[in-house]
């Protein structure tokens, strides 16, 4: 028997066990944060699922992902949201230490889909495990892509008071307006909820002093922010190392000096 | 030792209404999806009902889609199905099940069976 | 009809090895969804012998064992004994349904 044709994308295939990873993922989570234990993890996969089974890939929208949104509805305290950008795994890492901080990732709905890839096809009822479109090479409306720029948007929405976000000082665009955080978040933060956002710029070379807060798009940041009656501050975070080791440690004699 | 143990079953006539009722006991009830099956005489299992662990999701078979309802009470440890509209071909043993894990995983334990007839 | 075929009947001698087979298709089977296995003496109620395509539940003899390969599964008894005799169904999760699905069951007698 041939096989059904099936359209053959750029990008990589669904995560193996896609199904049930999320569903493991969603137990783990519901178990360890009481707020979510009301959370029915059969209901949010079933929506996960519908927001892209059977749908063409490359036309996925904001609302097709709107019953899990609901269902994944959750709230960060104000002064509490760490927003990144190109610099996931040290912001992690920091949450990690810091556990009253959040990024999208400490979230259900983030924790979820971290590092995990879906697609369906047109018409049938199947998970296509072997290619999903590409952003560049093949569209932008995909079921990854626009899954992160839905939660993305409603987390930067929802946040209050002091925004933090972790940039990467050792990228040529340390502030980039194509990234989600660039595109997305910075846009949706809400000037009559939000008071402040603080740019973490963290620092690559051991010995790179520069002050990168006077980066020109750091400055280009500035400008889109104050432009949206929201307060900007920037720190450098030279050693990032230390940094981590500090926020485990403050009381650390080495941490009273700059980190 | 887990056990599910159905009750509610007799007969009922045409266009009538019944609802089963499933203890179950020896495990957290409230960890699993539940599930309803059903054998006409005869025949083999006809999958009829799952519900999730906390309620949030229900599905059902085309054939008693708008006729059946699946609940569960989590502080009872109890599983309900609530059957209107009977009609004769819905005759059969009843049996809940318990679901592995999820609702895909398939059915680990199985109560014995409460029997069902519809007849004038 | 059932979603998923098997054969109505399948027999063998007692030592024997036997396989019953389920077939789906792309929408449950196929689509990464698991089979299970289910053994229902006579007069008695079904029992779970085999889940996520291949693992026993405690209390269930190695005899048994499940495999899949695209869209169909099979259930293979190894050294057939005479309490074997049952009707033995298969079952997975149907994407387009958004049901369970149970084959029509396979008879089988031991000879």
């Known amino acids: 028997v041939l096989p059904r044709w099936r359209q053959q994308w750029s990008g990589s295939g669904t995560t193996s066990r896609f199904p049930e990873t999320v569903l493991a993922r969603c137990v783990k989570y519901t178990e360890v944060h009481p707020e979510m234990r009301h959370v029915d993890c059969q209901s949010v996969w079933d929506a996960f699922k519908g927001a892209f089974i059977s749908k063409y890939p490359c036309n996925i929208t904001e609302e097709d992902y709107q019953p899990l949104v609901k269902l994944g509805t959750q709230t960060v305290p104000c002064n509490k949201t760490l927003l990144w950008s190109r610099i996931k795994d040290l912001a992690h890492q920091f949450t990690q230490v810091q556990r009253d901080m959040f990024t999208l990732e400490d979230m259900l709905l983030g924790y979820l889909a971290d590092d995990l890839t879906w697609c369906g096809e047109f018409n049938t009822f199947e998970i296509n495990y072997q290619s999903c479109p590409d952003w560049r090479k093949d569209c932008s409306n995909n079921p990854v892509s626009v899954f992160w720029k839905t939660v993305s948007r409603r987390f930067a929405e929802t946040a209050c008071g002091v925004v933090h976000v972790m940039l990467n000082g050792s990228r040529s665009k340390i502030f980039d307006k194509n990234s989600t955080f660039g595109s997305v978040e910075v846009h949706n933060l809400q000037p009559e909820k939000v008071q402040a956002l603080e740019a973490w710029v963290i620092h690559g070379g051991r010995e790179d002093s520069r002050d990168l807060c006077q980066d020109p798009t750091i400055k280009e940041l500035e400008s889109i922010i104050s432009k949206r009656n929201i307060r900007f501050f920037c720190k450098n975070i030279y050693r990032p190392d230390k940094f981590l080791q500090c926020v485990k440690n403050p009381e650390d004699s080495s941490c009273l000096s700059g980190i | 030792e887990v056990q599910l143990l159905e009750s509610g079953g007799g007969l009922v006539q045409p266009g009538g209404s019944l609802r089963l009722s499933c203890a179950a006991s020896g495990f957290l009830f409230d960890d699993y999806g539940m599930s309803w099956v059903r054998q006409a005489p005869g025949k083999g299992l006809e999958w009829v009902s799952a519900i999730s662990y906390k309620g949030g999701s229900t599905y059902y078979a085309d054939s008693v889609k708008g006729r059946f309802t699946i609940s569960r009470d989590n502080s009872k440890n109890t599983l309900y199905l609530q059957m209107s509209s009977l009609r004769a071909e819905d005759t059969a043993v009843y049996y809940c099940?318990?679901?592995?894990?999820?609702?895909?995983?398939?059915?680990?334990?199985w109560g014995q069976g409460t029997t069902v007839t519809v007849s004038s | 009809q059932s979603v998923l075929t098997q054969p109505p009947s399948a027999s063998g001698t007692p030592g024997q090895r036997v396989t019953i087979s389920c077939s789906g298709s792309?929408?449950?089977?196929?689509?990464?969804?698991?089979v299970s296995w289910y053994q229902q003496l006579p007069g008695t109620a079904p029992r779970l012998l085999i889940y996520?395509?291949?693992q026993r539940p405690s209390g269930v003899p190695d005899r048994f064992s499940g495999s899949k390969s695209g869209t169909s599964a099979s259930l293979a008894i190894s050294g057939l004994q005479s309490e074997d005799e049952a009707d033995y169904y298969c079952?997975?999760?149907?994407?387009?349904?958004?049901?369970?699905?149970f084959g029509g069951g396979t008879k089988l007698t031991v000879l």
């Open positions: 792309t929408s449950n089977i196929g689509n990464d969804n698991y």
């Open positions: 079952g997975t999760w149907d994407d387009r349904l958004n049901a369970w699905v």
């Open positions: 996520k395509d291949d």
């Open positions: 099940a318990k679901d592995h894990k999820w609702n895909y995983y398939g059915m680990d334990v």
